[in-house]
């Protein structure tokens, strides 16, 4: 699996992907905000 995430439970895998997506969205917003403020 591409980024080293390992879990034996499919629902846990889906949860991990959801958390990753949320963090990507939050970090993306912060990055955009920083660029905007420059």
């Amino acid at each position: 699996h591409s980024d080293g995430i390992f879990t034996d439970s499919y629902s846990r895998y889906r949860k991990q992907m959801a958390v990753k997506k949320y963090l990507a969205a939050v970090l993306g917003k912060r990055y955009k905000q920083r660029v905007k403020n420059k």
Partner: antibody, heavy 117, light 112 residues
């Protein structure tokens, strides 16, 4: 309504590779879990692996590890399953399927891959 | 891997009679999220499978209420309360709780 349309039937020689495509429409492609399942003639179903296109994150069945590669092109809403080192036992109908609620809610029409010398 | 054992392999039932298919898993399918990812599929000749039941007992929208799923842990049942001609198909259970996802061998339902 989600629709999955797969590429046409293929005839391949032993030792070669095959790449099957699955084009999705009617949903948000990047935010789905796209699975591949195969069915040998007159046999049951066998899970091969999945991809989560938003991160291109993949998970493969142990049986196919090292021989299967699942990819996705978000720009065309298309997933691909490539199986290498083909043998006669790989003759099967290959299906793509989309997960909803932890279960395969939508299926492609299937692609018959025949491996024969 | 989780082994899914379906029984019987085939079943001949008269129209209007009850058909019962059993499915047993080698490990509990109850997930840490409280859900049981046991699913039932129907497959007619030359067609892709179709989802009938998920979460062990939740019927897919549009599926007739003569189809019902029950069970928990490792033992599950699909019941067709009154068999219709259009129900002739192969039925598969499969588990989506644990990697690798695994399927039962299928049960062929025919009319007696």
């Amino acid at each position: 309504e989600v629709q999955l349309v797969q590429s046409g039937a293929e005839v391949k020689k032993p030792g070669s590779s095959v790449k099957v495509s699955c084009k999705a429409s009617g949903g948000t492609f990047s935010d789905v879990y796209m699975h591949w399942v195969r069915q040998a003639p007159g046999q049951g179903l066998e899970w091969m692996g999945l991809i989560y296109p938003i991160f291109a994150d993949t998970r493969y069945a142990q049986k196919f590890q090292g021989r299967v590669t699942i990819t996705a092109d978000e720009s065309t809403s298309t997933a691909y399953m490539e199986l290498s080192s083909l043998r006669s036992e790989d003759t099967a109908v290959y299906y793509c399927a989309i997960d909803q609620d932890g279960s395969f809610a939508y299926w492609g029409q299937g692609t018959l891959v025949t491996v024969s010398s | 891997d989780i082994v899914m054992t379906q029984s019987p392999d085939s079943l001949a039932v008269s129209l209007g009679e009850r058909a019962t298919i059993n499915c047993k898993s080698s490990q509990s399918l109850l997930d840490s999220d409280g859900k049981t990812y046991l699913n039932w599929l129907q497959q007619k000749p030359g067609q892709p499978p179709k989802r009938l039941i998920y979460w062990a007992s939740t019927r897919e929208s549009g599926v007739p209420d003569r189809f019902s799923g029950s069970g928990s842990g490792t033992d599950f049942t699909l019941t067709i309360s009154s068999l219709q001609a259009e129900d002739v198909a192969v039925y598969y259970c499969w588990q989506g709780t644990w990697f690798d996802l695994t399927f039962g061998g299928g049960t062929k339902v025919e009319i007696k």
